[in-house]
Interface confidence: low
């Protein structure tokens, strides 16, 4: 679980979307709960389907798979998982908050031609070498980027990841997710990990009973959750006494 400590809130949110885990905003008080959910998802996935040892098919760190035991934290979701995120029937208006896109998942996709990278899909024989010292803060965006979001995007939808069909067969594949489309003249739109499923996905409130122990003790929070509750309780009691004495005064004006 400590592997997720280096992830920014933005990156954690992206993982939640990728794994199709219903979530609200990632903040200090909810972070540990989400880390736990992601950990459980990845653990379960590895248990159900052992990692494929085949080489990756792209120019991305993300696709550098490895057969080493210490590398399995860095595998992509299987193609079956990725297909969930690309369901054509998905029409929810769940808003993509980060990574420089402002589209909703229900928008049509571009059928434009793929460019340079798509034409030369490669595999990396040195994936193991890359993976053996990788930690989880090697990610594309730090949390500061969340503040810069609503700008024009810079990467294109029409890249090596436009179609999932040119990857290995489902049985032994790892595939990356679709890039989202954003129509700009610069052929550029930063990729957004869509995590939609075949059924509609809506935001759900985080229920206290689902929290991991100590989930309330967020990194950003200066006053712990129990402290806030205590303060609130004191505040309520003070208000009650004020109300009580005011009522008493009204009853006996002399």
């Amino acid at each position: 679980m400590d592997n997720y400590a280096d992830l920014s809130d933005t990156e954690l949110t992206t993982l939640l979307r990728r794994y199709n885990i219903p979530h609200g905003p990632v903040v200090g008080s909810t972070r540990r709960l989400y880390e736990k959910k992601i950990f459980e998802y990845e653990t379960q996935r590895r248990r159900l389907s052992p990692p494929s040892s085949s080489a990756a098919s792209s120019y991305s760190f993300s696709d550098l798979n490895s057969t080493r035991g210490d590398a399995d934290m860095y595998d992509l979701p299987k193609k079956e998982d990725a297909l969930l995120y690309q369901s054509k029937g998905y029409n929810d208006d769940y808003y993509e908050e980060s990574y420089f896109t402002t589209r909703t998942y229900g928008e049509p996709e571009s059928a434009g031609p793929s460019r340079a990278v798509r034409q030369s899909v490669t595999s990396f024989p040195d994936a193991d070498a890359f993976h053996h010292q990788v930690h989880d803060d090697d990610l594309l965006s730090s949390s500061e980027e969340e503040c810069k979001d609503r700008e024009r995007p810079m990467y294109g939808r029409d890249s090596a990841y436009q179609s999932i069909t040119h990857y290995r067969p489902v049985s032994a594949s790892r595939s990356s997710l679709d890039l989202s489309y954003y129509p700009t003249s610069s052929s550029t739109s930063f990729m957004s990990s869509s995590s939609s499923s075949s059924s509609w996905l809506t935001r759900r409130a985080i229920r206290p009973e689902n929290r991991a122990p100590g989930a309330g003790l967020g990194q950003d929070r200066q006053v712990p959750l129990w402290g806030q509750l205590l303060l609130f309780l004191v505040f309520v009691i003070v208000l009650f006494f004020i109300y009580h004495f005011m009522q008493a005064e009204e009853g006996n004006p002399f």
Epitope: E11, L15, D63, A116, D137, L139, L140, S141, S159, T188
Partner: nanobody, 122 residues
Framework: DVQLVESGGGLVQAGGSLRLSCATS????????MAWFRQAPGKEREFVAG????????YYTDSVKGRFNITRDNAKNTVYLQMNSLKPEDTAVYYC???????????????WGQGTQVTVST
């Protein structure tokens, strides 16, 4: 529009050194992992070295470990590849690009830069 511009390549004798630079314009890339790739004639483009967004983690392909060093200067929006003890097999066109791991697969520019030619003579 974001552009990647690689520079610093050239002709060098085996055992020599070069320092490649990758400058970006159009948007700060300080929040993104970056990587160097290379493509030798008749071969596929391959990963050489990577650095995470904070600069705290670096990754290398086996063949360059101990010889190459990737660094970044986020203030200058530039990524560097210091190449020492160069070998003839390091001859290739070197490209830089955005790279990342499991959270955001495939996050790199559609159009690669021109690259910079590195030629190592015997």
């Amino acid at each position: 529009d974001v552009q990647l511009v690689e520079s610093g390549g050239g002709l060098v004798q085996a055992g020599g050194s070069l320092r490649l630079s990758c400058a970006t314009s159009g948007r700060s890339l300080s929040s993104y992992a970056m990587a160097w790739f290379r493509q030798a004639p008749g071969k596929e483009r391959e990963f050489v070295a990577g650095i995470n967004f904070s600069g705290r983690r670096t990754y290398y392909t086996d063949s360059v470990k101990g010889r190459f060093n990737i660094t970044r200067d986020n203030a200058k929006n530039t990524v560097y590849l210091q190449m020492n003890s160069l070998k003839p097999e390091d001859t290739a066109v070197y490209y830089c690009n955005v790279g990342g791991r499991k959270v955001l697969a495939g996050t790199f520019f559609n159009d690669w830069g021109q690259g910079t030619q590195v030629t190592v003579s015997t």
